[in-house]
């Protein structure tokens, strides 16, 4: 068996997906109910736990214990503000551990407590098992996709969901750069162009500008809502239904959990179906205290609800456009990802915004960012596909990144959308006389003081020689690789001593011993891997060209052209070589060229004779090659699961 | 009558490379595949490897990668078999053979002796 | 890589008698489509090159003596001289042809 893909997976706040990037293109993975998308809900029963399309359906049974928006707490603590105002629309209990987020839940009938991580990380089980499932081989290694305002602790919580789930994360990736690489895919144009990635989701709002020249991906900018999408225009639904409901049958069901979540289930379907109609109905038996409750509502009137909501949405367009220094003519294409672009308001608003420029959909929205996470997956894993070998991607630094400096400032060296890899160096000095050290404290974050910024480490350098305040000269460097590692180096330039650190977002990282062990594994494993797509690939010329040469002599169109003694030649070889292929499947590549060319020897000379006069292919499209005229082996299978 | 023709014997210094050639007749070349064997004195029968006369595309036996290159001229119907480097262990008799079902022709066997 | 081991290195027999060479693979050298065994026999007489005698395991090349037979299956297969003549002292050798090729060590056959 070849190499085992690398899977893409868009852990999305509501809905997830899954692609493979093999035989030269990107596979959406459906589920087991046939669908290309799958709800990031985990359920939790007296009997079992569900997750995906189980989950979801069973929510308004069982609400308290049906758990979905995970992304909305993962990496955060409990007091952050999102974290208590999210927990008020939630049907399920968050509870205070040591303020880290779990949720609480009754499973088998005892209380459980889960880290946002766990449950991420079934979602997570459940679409690698979606991969396993289509793919029929285990899946380990997978790049996840994580909105572009994610931090730091964020990005390393979601990480740790996939190492929860038996995934080797090869990377976390922006979602709107994974949007861009499936994108950039679909285009054959020459000439650097920028595209503007407007990707509303159900959770998340991302705005992203790129550069894309022959196949080179720069993030030039991003800006968004963390906190946008979908899912606010279905409680704008939500609580559009509720008022009516209260008008015509007096009775408020706002405190009803079930009936809330019934009702939020109908206005979702409703809000898909004004994608396309410009009225849908709700039919819902028995909503509230026995009553039930048929509406309809227009499109007019949904567009009129969410005006506020849609509107906003160009403010971060605006503001990605002012940091990436371009003006709204200078955007060459316009990028829809995301389910909720879908909606035809928000693609008016974005389009009279760009003066009627015309909007690219042919990605499918609610897939683009799985597409682009495969294709990268595959990049890392060495794919050598034409489609991807050239592609280089530059990703962003998502939030600037600096110092503490005197009074508690915030002083940033590598500016939020700076392309990774970058290296900034800046000269930095002491605030008191004679001060023997200097405590350098890196963060991240945008605001002017570092209290409300977020700490990522921080390290001494002591033994700075006497001297005035404002003399010494204490170099800092930041340096951010292509993995989002960064190292923060000190240098005193009177003595050249310096002190450093590593920044990784891996807690409990590997030995130096160990990496460098399995740097050499590896090593030995892609040479392993590639005599084994080798062998494969010698194995499928040998079985193509088998078959063909047996069709082709068996073909009717030959009667009377072929002698009955070549035939039984032919077909005599070509069993031989098939049965011996039946028998020899783990056959070396050596051996399976040895019997092409065995083969070829015989069928040949016979075959070529057949068309010598006649200036066309053979049977089956092959041309009839004289001595010397190449392996005549047919059509060679390019990738091989 | 199908006959296969050797050249002569070769004697070479360690280093050294020798091109030995095996030319066909009375049959169609392209048709049958051309199998080199070795035969050091006093030894058995050691498989070279082959080449596919009709697209030019060698087999090598584990063995005698490297170093041995075969080839073919399909306008005289010769195989060629050359060896480079030669070392002293190279000393033996070099045979081509046809290949219908089996080695059905063979050539009358070409002796490289290498010595300093 | 097959590996054939020829058995035994060297045999002496009477002018008239039977010789039995065994000639035993390290895996089967059948094929189950073609109801083959690829299988073949060679004899190389002093300062000669080796000649086809059997092929498959026992199709007598044409011109070849009936009094030499093959027989074997899978793994294990013999060369038979029914009744040995002056002109049949030589060594023989196996060679398969399942996959790739290979030659046995050679059998010596003289008279006693």
């Known amino acids: 068996m070849a190499k085992a893909a690398a899977i893409g997976i868009d852990l999305g706040t509501t809905y997830s997906c899954v692609g493979v990037f093999q035989h030269g293109k990107v596979e959406i993975i459906a589920n087991d109910q046939g669908n290309r998308t799958t709800p990031s809900y985990v359920a939790f029963t007296d009997t079992e736990r569900l997750i995906g399309d189980a989950a979801k359906n069973q929510v308004a049974l069982n609400p308290q214990n049906t758990v979905f928006d995970a992304k909305r707490l993962i990496g955060r603590k409990f007091g952050d503000p999102v974290v208590q105002s999210d927990m008020k629309h939630w049907p399920f209990q968050v509870i205070n551990d040591g303020d880290k987020p779990k949720v609480q839940v009754s499973y088998k009938g005892e209380t459980k407590a889960f880290y946002p991580e766990e449950i991420s990380s079934m979602v997570l089980t459940k679409m690698k098992e979606i991969a396993e499932a289509y793919l029929g081989y285990p899946v380990t290694n997978a790049v996840i996709t994580v909105p572009a305002y994610f931090n730091d602790s964020q990005r390393q919580a979601t990480k740790d969901a996939g190492v929860i789930a038996g995934l080797n994360v090869l990377r976390i990736i922006n979602e709107p750069t994974a949007a861009a690489i499936a994108y950039g895919l679909d285009r054959t144009g020459k000439g650097e162009r920028n595209v503007l990635i407007f990707d509303l989701g159900g959770g998340t709002f991302d705005v992203s500008i790129l550069t894309i020249d022959d196949g080179i991906f720069e993030v030039k900018a991003t800006a968004g809502d963390t906190h946008l999408g979908g899912e606010d225009f279905d409680n704008r639904l939500v609580n559009h239904f509720v008022e009516e409901f209260k008008r015509k049958h007096k009775k408020d069901i706002s405190q009803n959990k079930r009936a809330v979540r019934r009702l939020r289930t109908a206005c979702e379907r409703a809000k898909r179906t004004l994608s396309s109609s410009t009225q849908a109905s709700l039919e819902i038996d028995s909503l509230f205290e026995g009553i039930d409750f048929y509406t309809s509502i227009t499109r007019a009137r949904f567009e009129e609800l969410c005006s506020d909501l849609f509107r906003s949405t160009l403010e971060p367009v605006e503001k990605a456009l002012r940091d990436a220094k371009l003006d709204k003519a200078q955007i060459h294409d316009l990028v829809l990802v995301g389910g909720s672009t879908r909606i035809p308001k928000v693609q008016k608003l974005l389009q009279d915004f760009f003066n009627g420029r015309d909007l690219n959909k042919s990605i499918n929205p609610d897939e683009a960012v799985a597409y682009g996470a495969a294709v990268q997956a595959a990049i890392l894993m060495g794919d050598k596909s034409e489609n991807v070998q050239d592609l280089l991607l530059l990703d962003v630094a998502p939030l600037s990144l600096g110092l503490e400096t005197a009074g508690g400032v915030m002083t940033a060296l590598i500016k939020r959308n700076s392309t990774i890899p970058t290296k900034q160096t800046q000269i930095f000095t002491t605030y008191s006389d004679n001060q023997p050290g200097v405590l350098i404290q890196v963060y991240e974050g945008e605001r002017a003081m570092t209290k409300d910024n977020n700490l990522l480490g921080r390290f001494e350098l002591s033994g700075i020689p006497p001297a005035p305040r404002g003399v010494p000269q204490i170099e800092v460097t930041f340096d951010i690789d292509a993995n989002g590692i960064l190292n923060v180096t000190a240098t005193d330039k009177s003595t050249g001593k310096a002190n450093k650190i590593t920044i990784t977002n891996d807690k409990g990282r590997l030995s130096k011993e160990e990496i460098e062990r399995m740097v050499q594994e590896a090593e030995k494993y892609k040479a392993e891997d590639e005599v084994q797509r080798e062998r494969v690939s010698a194995k499928n010329a040998l079985e193509s060209y088998a078959f063909n040469m047996k069709s082709a002599v068996e073909d009717e169109g030959l009667k009377g052209k072929i002698s009955e003694a070549d035939k039984k030649k032919v077909l005599d070889k070509c069993q031989e070589v098939i049965s011996w292929l039946d028998a020899n499947t783990l056959a070396e590549k050596d051996e399976f060229e040895h019997k092409r060319k065995e083969l070829e020897q015989v069928c040949n000379p016979i075959i070529s004779g057949l068309y010598q006069g006649a200036g066309g292919p053979g049977p089956g499209g092959f041309g009839a090659q004289g001595p010397k005229g190449g392996s005549g082996s047919g059509p060679t299978i390019e990738e091989v699961d | 009558q199908i006959q296969l023709v050797q050249s002569g014997a070769e004697v070479k210094k360690p280093g050294a490379s020798v091109k030995v050639s095996c030319k066909a007749s009375g049959y169609t070349f392209t048709n049958y595949g051309m199998n080199w064997v070795r035969q050091a004195p006093g030894q058995g029968l050691e498989w070279m490897g082959w080449i596919n006369t009709y697209t030019g595309e060698p087999t090598y036996a584990d063995d005698f990668k490297g170093r041995f290159t075969f080839t073919t001229d399909t306008s005289t119907s010769t195989a060629y078999m050359e060896l480079r480097s030669l070392r002293s262990d190279d000393t033996a008799v070099y045979f081509c053979?046809?290949?219908?079902?089996?080695?059905?022709?063979w050539g009358q066997g070409t002796l490289v002796t290498v010595s300093s | 890589e097959i590996v054939l081991t020829q058995s035994p290195d060297s045999l002496a027999v009477s002018l008239g008698e039977r010789a039995t060479i065994n000639c035993k693979s390290s895996?089967?050298?059948?094929?189950?489509?073609?109801?083959?065994?690829?299988l073949a026999w060679y004899q190389q007489k002093a300062g000669q090159s080796p000649k086809l005698l059997i092929y498959w395991t026992s199709t007598r090349e044409s011109g070849v003596p009936d009094r030499f037979s093959g027989s074997g299956s899978g793994t294990d297969f013999t060369l038979t001289i029914d009744s040995l003549q002056a002109e049949d002292v030589a060594v023989y050798y196996c060679?398969?042809?399942?996959?790739?090729?290979?030659f046995g060590g050679g059998t010596k056959v003289e008279i006693k």
């Open positions: 895996q089967s050298l059948f094929n189950s489509g073609t109801r083959k065994n690829y």
């Open positions: 053979a046809r290949y219908d079902h089996a080695m059905d022709y």
């Open positions: 060679k398969q042809s399942y996959t790739l090729y290979t």
